[in-house]
Interface confidence: low
C-alpha cells in the first residue's frame, strides 16, 4: 500500500485584503479514515482554521464538494481576507482516534496579504512660523502590506529633499505603517502654497494616494507698517494714514495712540485678499492741530495674530505749522521691533 501523501502545491499565495484566498490541498488516498484539518502555524501553538469533519467556521468554505466520497480535494477558501490572516497554513491529515492522531502534514502555504495603505494624513506645526523659518510636516499612513512602499513630498509640485521616513515595524508583520517628516523653508509667498505627501504601493496599481496640507495653516506673514500724513486741510485738521500691508492671517488689531493715549481701536475684518493670499489694511486718523499747543505724537500700534505689538510713530509739529493748506510737517518713526517693518515718515 503506497504511503499517504498530503499535497499543498503552492508554497505561497498573495491575496488583496477583502478578497478570498484559496488554499489548495489534495490527498492521495482516503484511507485511513480520519479528518482533514487546516491550521495556521506549526507546533503546539498552531491555530485551527478549519476542520473538514465538524465545526463552525463562517469565513471558510470547501472549494470542491466534500460530500462526494471519491473527493480527495480538501482545498479551502477563506473569504474577506484581512492582514491578520497572514501566515503559513498547513493541511493536515489525521487518523481517527481518541484524540485523532496526526498522520501527515502538507508542506504549508504561506499566505501574504496585500493591504492598501490608509489615506495619508498630513499634519503641520502646532504654531505658525514666519517666513525664512523652517517648519516640519508629518505624513502618516497605516495598515499596508507588503512592507515595500514609496513616499514622496512635494511643495507646489516640486519634490522636497529634506525628508526623513520610517516604516514600522522593522521585522516581519501582518501590516506596516509609514511616518515621514519633511522640513519646509517658508517664504512670504507661501500663503497659497501646498505640501503633498504621495504614497505609492503595489496595491494601488500606479495610482498613488495623496495627503495635502496648506501652508496657510502654518505660516504667519507679519505686516509692513507705514504711517504718512496727507496735506493739511483748511480746517486745521491733519489726516494721518497707517498702511498695514502684506500680512497673513487676517487676524489683526490696530490701535491709534495720541501722545500715548488710546484714541481708537479697530479690528480687521472682511478684507479683500491680495493675489499672494496676504491682506492690506489702511486706517486714517484726523488730528485737529489747532486743539494742540505742543507737538502731537501719533502711534499706529498693530497686534497681528496674537504676536507682540508693532508700533510706528509719527510726530505732528504743531509750533511750526502755518495755517495755509499744504504746509510741511516733521515726522518721527519710532518703535520698530525686530520684524521687517519698513515705513517712512510723511
Amino acid at each position: 500500500e503506497e504511503e499517504l501523501q498530503v499535497i499543498q502545491p503552492e508554497k505561497s499565495v498573495s491575496v488583496a485584503a477583502g478578497d478570498s484566498a484559496t488554499l489548495n490541498c489534495t490527498v492521495s488516498s482516503l484511507i485511513p479514515v480520519g479528518p482533514i484539518q487546516w491550521f495556521r502555524g506549526a507546533g503546539p501553538g498552531r491555530e485551527l482554521i478549519y476542520n473538514l469533519k465538524e465545526g463552525h467556521f463562517p469565513r471558510v468554505t470547501a472549494v470542491s464538494d466534500p460530500t462526494k466520497r471519491n473527493n480527495m480535494d480538501f482545498s479551502i477558501r477563506i473569504s474577506n481576507i484581512t492582514p491578520a490572516d497572514a501566515g503559513t497554513y498547513y493541511c493536515v491529515k489525521f487518523r481517527k482516534g481518541s484524540p485523532d492522531v496526526e498522520l501527515k502534514s502538507g508542506a504549508g502555504t504561506e499566505l501574504s496579504v496585500r493591504a492598501k495603505p490608509s489615506a495619508p494624513v498630513v499634519s503641520g506645526p502646532a504654531v505658525r512660523a514666519t517666513a525664512e523659518h523652517t517648519v516640519s510636516f508629518t505624513c502618516e499612513s497605516h495598515g499596508f502590506s507588503p512592507r515595500d512602499i514609496t513616499l514622496k513630498w512635494f511643495k507646489n509640485g516640486n519634490e522636497l529633499s529634506d525628508v526623513q521616513t520610517n516604516v514600522d515595524p522593522a521585522g516581519k508583520s501582518v501590516s506596516y505603517s509609514i511616518r515621514s517628516t519633511a522640513r519646509v523653508l517658508l517664504t512670504r509667498r507661501d500663503v497659497h502654497s501646498q505640501v503633498i505627501c504621495e504614497v505609492a504601493h503595489v496595491t494601488l496599481q500606479g495610482d498613488p494616494l495623496r495627503g495635502t496640507a496648506n501652508l496657510s495653516e502654518a505660516i504667519r506673514v507679519p505686516p509692513f507698517l507705514e504711517v504718512t500724513q496727507q496735506s493739511m486741510r483748511a480746517d486745521n485738521q491733519v489726516n494721518v494714514t497707517c498702511q498695514v500691508t502684506k500680512f497673513y492671517p487676517q487676524r489683526l488689531q490696530l490701535t491709534w495712540l495720541e501722545n500715548g493715549n488710546v484714541s481708537r481701536t479697530e479690528m480687521a475684518s472682511a478684507l479683500p485678499e491680495n493675489k499672494d493670499g496676504t491682506y492690506n489694511w489702511t486706517s486714517w486718523l484726523l488730528v485737529n492741530v489747532s486743539a494742540h499747543r505742543d507737538d502731537v505724537k501719533l502711534t499706529c500700534q498693530v497686534e497681528h495674530d496674537g504676536q507682540p505689538a508693532v508700533n510706528k510713530s509719527f510726530s505732528v509739529k504743531v509750533s511750526a505749522h502755518p495755517k495755509e493748506q499744504g504746509s510741511n510737517t516733521a515726522a518721527e518713526n519710532t518703535g520698530t521691533n525686530e520684524r521687517n517693518i519698513y515705513g517712512g515718515s510723511g
Partner: antibody, heavy 118, light 107 residues
C-alpha cells in the same frame, strides 16, 4: 430555523404519477446534497434518490427510469416526480438534507404519505 | 450494493440500562456510518455521523464507534424517551443503504 416541509403525497392508482415537493427554509438548498428516503408501512428506511450540488442525480435500482429528482433553486425547493407508480411504492416519503462535509443526513422533513392502490 | 446488517432486531431493556446495538457492513465503508432514532409516527432523527460524531443537540449518553465494517451504537443510561427504533446507514457510496432496524423496547 432550518426546516424541510414535504407536500404532494396522496392516493394514486397503479401506473399513475405524483410529484412530491420539499420546501427548504433556513438554508440554501442548492448548497447541499439533497435526498429522498421512504418507509413502507411497518417497514424500515429505504434510500430512494439524491441530487448533488452540481445537479448530479442518483437513484436506487427499483425506481430508476420511473422517478426523477430535481430542484428549483429560486424556490429553494426539492422535487420527486414519480411515474409508473406501483403498489410497492406505497410509503411515507421523507426529504432529507445531507451534511456539509460528508453527506451524513442531518435534517429530515416530517414526511408525506404516498398510497398506490386501485 | 453494500448490505447493512443490524443486530439484534429487537431488544428489551430497563430504564438506566446500558445498551449496545451493532451494525455490520458487507464491505469496508471507512467511517462513513450514521445512526438514526425513530419513534412511531415520527420522522427519523439523526444521532451520529462518521461513526462517532454526535449531531448538534444529541445528548452525550449516545456514543458510536467502529471503522471499516463493524460499528456499534451505545446508549449509556436508558431513559423512557430512548425507547424507539434505531437504524444504521452507510453513505460511502450510492445507493446509500440502511440496516433493517433495531427496536428497543421497555422491559
Amino acid at each position: 430555523e432550518v426546516q424541510l416541509v414535504e407536500s404532494g403525497g396522496g392516493l394514486v392508482q397503479p401506473g399513475g404519477s405524483l410529484r412530491l415537493s420539499c420546501a427548504a427554509s433556513g438554508f440554501t438548498l442548492s448548497s447541499y446534497d439533497m435526498h429522498w428516503v421512504r418507509q413502507a408501512p411497518g417497514k424500515g428506511l429505504e434510500w430512494v434518490s439524491a441530487i448533488g450540488t452540481a445537479g448530479d442525480t442518483y437513484y436506487t435500482g427499483s425506481v430508476k427510469g420511473r422517478f426523477t429528482i430535481s430542484r428549483e433553486n429560486a424556490k429553494n425547493s426539492l422535487y420527486l416526480q414519480m411515474n409508473s407508480l406501483r403498489a410497492d411504492d406505497t410509503a411515507v416519503y421523507y426529504c432529507v438534507r445531507g451534511g456539509v462535509w460528508d453527506d451524513a443526513f442531518d435534517i429530515w422533513g416530517q414526511g408525506t404519505m404516498v398510497t398506490v392502490s386501485s | 450494493d453494500i448490505q447493512m446488517t443490524q443486530s439484534p432486531s429487537s431488544l428489551s431493556a430497563s430504564v438506566g440500562d446500558r445498551v449496545t446495538i451493532t451494525c455490520r457492513a458487507s464491505q469496508d465503508i471507512n467511517n462513513y456510518l450514521a445512526w438514526f432514532q425513530q419513534k412511531p409516527g415520527k420522522a427519523p432523527k439523526s444521532l451520529i455521523y462518521t461513526a462517532s460524531s454526535l449531531h448538534s443537540g444529541v445528548p452525550s449518553k449516545f456514543s458510536g464507534s467502529g471503522s471499516g465494517t463493524d460499528f456499534t451504537l451505545t446508549i449509556s443510561s436508558l431513559q423512557p424517551e430512548d425507547f424507539a427504533t434505531y437504524y444504521c446507514q452507510q453513505y460511502v457510496s450510492y445507493p446509500y443503504t440502511f440496516g433493517q432496524g433495531t427496536k428497543l423496547e421497555i422491559k
